[in-house]
């Protein structure tokens, strides 16, 4: 029986009965917040073999092992993950071992096992046999291994039953519990699964099978399941569904998303039955189950019940996320905010059409209107008193409307009004008149030439770069010395630079008047020698990275014909040199015969250039003969058992920290202080833990359904 969609068992352990007939959970399985310690021995779900999304266990009192609950759980597919994880075991106070002895494959995602004060048998499981990459696993704050004394079956009797693998240079037995080995298939099977008797399964099987080389005997499917058979792709007239099975059109036509209060229904696209058309596609008509490509951004009409939508915060802008056509009027009144320009672009950047008017007033946080980066039409179907459809009043820091070289905006009906925008040059307004087709509509008082641009350097000269030199992490640039009419008016220069993968940045990107700016700024004093050209060395840059750079002259606010003269350069794009790449990630090696090793790795996170080849080096190592860390027959060798508190493992500091013995005659010396890099790494680690814990709490503590 397929159960789902997603099963959440909380508060009452008897809810576990819901799993009684499940063979596959299509979705996630949550078992959490059961605070009363119960006896779980009577609960056993041997039918459950597959969870298609993830398994989350959190604060379940009294549960000591998962092996009895889910003895045959073989595959967690990770089709959808919980914060990048397919298996999360968090704050399970009484869990002593994981015990999922039949778990053979986690298809996607990593594992997070954290703050389980009594949990052992973690170092005895080789997760690389279950997951593709173990580098993202997070196993922290559980019972310290030296307090666990984990013993695999048969070790005490000196008849070890489990197989050995190497983890972190330790060659050891692999097991889930004191009486359950970790299953490994013969090397002859390669990537294939195997039966209990070590016979290789059909290539389409995943995890295990009941008979060898038979695609109808799989416990789970590598690709898709259809009519009792594991298939590499869904047959004609069937469609992939939830990442693991094939369904027919009729099935897909009759299902609705439980996450929505509308009844939009699923669609078929690219051979898959899915909840929504993917990005860039739209349903082909109201009764259609199929998607067609959108021309440009997909249309989404948003309507304001009160006709006028006031944008006075990020929260109010959030309501417009994804909207391309706004039916109504926009009133923008942003007085303050953090990182406001990029937040507004995120939520309003897709708007193409406003059917009514646009009014921007008292928006002192705005430097530019470029956050409305796709606005192309203001219809002016509704206008302000005086027949205005674009109205800009008292915006103390507004300097740019849009980048008119890359913008077509039409105002179909209505006039424009501009007043009390002291940093907005009148030339910018006149340019908007031309582009929008409103020239001639405005009367004299509609664009005030006295109080617009009164505090801006509106007459700008162009600074020209004279030389650029690059290295792997530095750029040196120089530019012509700017000579204003009165040399004393030139104070200094400011260099602005930022990473720019594409040559499409503008001066006002990500900039607002509250201090947020996506550009880095460096002040450059005037060279004392009048014949030396000003310049700067930008350092601490990333190798093989394109940067955008421009320079502005800082001048006295000298008024000349009611305007301040200034100077700035065009934006220059320049790439740093290539450098040595960072180390390759997730290096894994496995032997597939007595004379071969297969080595796999992922590319480096920082290629620092175009990678052309890898160098693989190897050398023979002497076999590790020191197989036993402890002699368990000798009482004095067994570590003292102490109950772990479920906090993060930190070596205890004794009264006298002088533990390391230095070479020669020096005697004991203090442990080295942590480097800045180590401190930073610890800080980031602590931050990451907090972020995950917040995510966990926000996800699982939800209001009771009505």
């Amino acid at each position: 029986e397929i159960c789902g969609p997603g099963i959440d068992i909380r508060n009452d352990y008897q809810q576990l009965k819901r799993l009684e007939n499940c063979t596959v959970i299509e979705g996630y399985l949550h078992i959490l917040l059961i605070s009363k310690a119960e006896d779980y021995r009577s609960y056993r779900f041997p039918k459950l073999t597959v969870i298609t999304e993830y398994l989350l266990l959190f604060r379940v009192a009294g549960l000591e092992s998962l092996g009895d609950l889910f003895p045959n759980l073989t595959v967690i597919r990770g089709w959808k993950l919980f914060y990048n994880y397919a298996l999360v075991i968090f704050e399970m106070t009484n869990l002593k071992d994981i015990g999922l002895y039949n778990l053979r494959n986690i298809t996607r995602g990593a594992i997070r096992i954290e703050k389980n004060a009594d949990l052992c048998y973690l170092s005895t499981v080789d997760w690389s046999l279950i997951l593709d990459a173990v580098s993202n696993n997070y196993i922290v704050g559980n019972k310290p291994p030296k307090e666990c004394g984990d013993l695999c079956p048969g070790t005490m009797e000196e008849k070890p039953m489990c197989e050995k693998t190497t983890i972190n240079n330790e060659y050891n037995y692999r097991c889930w519990t004191t009486n359950r080995c970790q299953k490994m298939c013969p090397s002859t099977c390669g990537k294939r699964a195997c039966t209990e008797n070590n016979e290789c399964c059909h290539p389409e099987c995943l995890g295990s099978c009941s008979a060898p080389d038979n695609d109808t005997a799989c416990v789970a499917c590598r690709h898709y399941y259809y009519a009792g058979v594991c298939v590499p792709a869904c047959p004609p007239n069937t469609y992939r569904f939830e990442g693991w099975r094939c369904v027919d059109r009729d099935f897909c036509a009759n299902i609705l998303s439980a996450e929505s209060s509308d009844s939009e229904g699923f669609v078929i696209h690219d051979g898959e039955c899915m909840q929504e058309c993917p990005s860039g596609f739209i349903r082909n008509g109201s009764q259609s189950m199929y998607c067609i490509p959108c021309e440009g951004p997909c249309p989404k009409v948003c309507e304001e019940e009160k006709k006028t939508k006031t944008i006075d915060s990020v929260t109010s802008a959030q309501m417009l996320q994804g909207c391309t056509i706004f039916k109504g009027n926009l009133l923008i009144n942003i007085r303050r905010g953090n990182n406001i320009a990029s937040e507004l672009e995120n939520f309003m950047g897709l708007i193409e059409v406003v059917t009514g008017y646009v009014k921007i007033r008292h928006s002192h946080a705005l430097v530019s209107l470029s956050f409305l980066k796709n606005l192309r039409l203001i219809l002016g179907e509704e206008q302000l008193e005086g027949n205005y459809s674009f109205y800009v009043l008292d915006n103390q820091n507004l300097q740019q409307l849009w980048d008119w070289d890359h913008r077509n905006l039409t105002i179909k009906a209505g006039k424009m009004y501009f007043a009390f925008n002291p940093k907005l040059c009148v030339s910018e307004i006149y340019r908007m008149e031309e582009v929008t087709g409103t020239k001639g509509r405005q009367s004299k008082g509609d664009i005030n030439t006295r109080n617009n641009g009164e505090r801006a350097s509106c007459e700008s000269d162009v600074l020209h770069f004279t030389s650029t030199t690059t290295s792997k992490n530095r750029i040196i640039i120089t530019w012509h010395r700017y000579r204003p009419p009165d040399y004393r008016d030139l104070i200094s220069f400011t260099v602005y630079y930022k990473e720019a993968p594409f040559k499409n940045v503008t001066e006002y990107d990500g900039q607002d008047a509250c201090g947020s700016n996506s550009w880095n700024m460096v002040d450059v004093d005037l060279p004392p020698n009048k014949d030396v050209e000003p310049g700067i060395l930008l350092h601490g840059l990333k190798p093989w990275t394109q940067y955008a750079v421009y320079v502005k002259a800082v001048t006295l606010t000298m008024v000349e014909n009611d305007h301040i003269r200034g100077a700035k350069s065009e934006i220059l794009y320049i790439r740093t040199n290539a450098s040595v790449p960072s180390i390759p990630l997730d290096v894994l090696s496995a032997s597939n015969s007595s004379s071969q090793l297969i080595v796999k790795w992922n590319p480096p996170s920082l290629p620092n250039g175009n990678l052309s080849y890898y160098i693989v080096r190897w050398q023979r190592q002497p076999q590790d003969g020191y197989l036993y860390r402890h002699n368990y027959c000798s009482k004095d060798k067994i570590p003292i058992r102490k109950y772990a508190d479920g906090t993060i493992d930190i070596e205890e500091v004794t009264e006298n920290p002088k533990t390391e013995v230095c070479g020669g005659e020096k005697g004991p010396c203090c442990a080295c202080p942590k480097t800045e890099a180590e401190k930073q790494a610890e800080k980031e680690e602590a931050e990451y833990r907090k972020v995950f814990e917040n995510f966990l709490h926000n996800s699982i503590f939800v209001p009771r359904p009505e």
């Epitope: 299902i255 609705l256 439980a258 996450e259 209060s261 009844s263």
Partner: nanobody, 128 residues
């Protein structure tokens, strides 16, 4: 408070027609999916038809396809079910229901668990 009031039921001869209405209040009608269910004496409640809010996509049970038509008027906050070629087996109490968010994943349009609010029902009797 959400309210759904069905009307338009009554006695009709086989082959006849009826139009059911469901007047809704207490929620933003134009953003919620709606459906008609029915329950015949001694039988389980079953889905008859459903309609989405945004696009008007419709769903019908096999037994009523081609005979019944669901529609909605968002400006009047009303859901309709036009029933033609009625048969004796269509006799039942007809309920109007409104969709609700119901956790994760999916469900079939005719599953009652996907609907959060229900009307009191209107009786339709098809008899000669």
């Amino acid at each position: 408070e959400v309210q759904l009031v069905e009307s338009g039921g009554g006695l009709v001869q086989p082959g006849g027609s009826l139009r059911l209405s469901c007047a809704a209040s207490g929620f933003t009608f134009g953003t919620f999916g709606m459906a008609w269910f029915r329950q015949a004496p001694g039988k389980e409640r079953e889905g008859v038809s459903a309609i989405s809010a945004s696009s008007g996509r419709t769903y019908y049970a096999d037994s009523v396809k081609g005979r019944f038509t669901i529609s909605r008027d968002n400006s009047k906050n009303t859901l309709y079910l036009q029933m033609n070629s009625l048969r004796a087996e269509d006799t039942a109490v007809y309920y109007c229901a409104v969709r609700s968010k119901n956790g994760a994943g999916y469900g079939f349009w005719y599953e009652a668990r996907l609907y959060g609010y229900w009307g009191q029902g209107t009786l339709v009797t098809v008899s000669s």
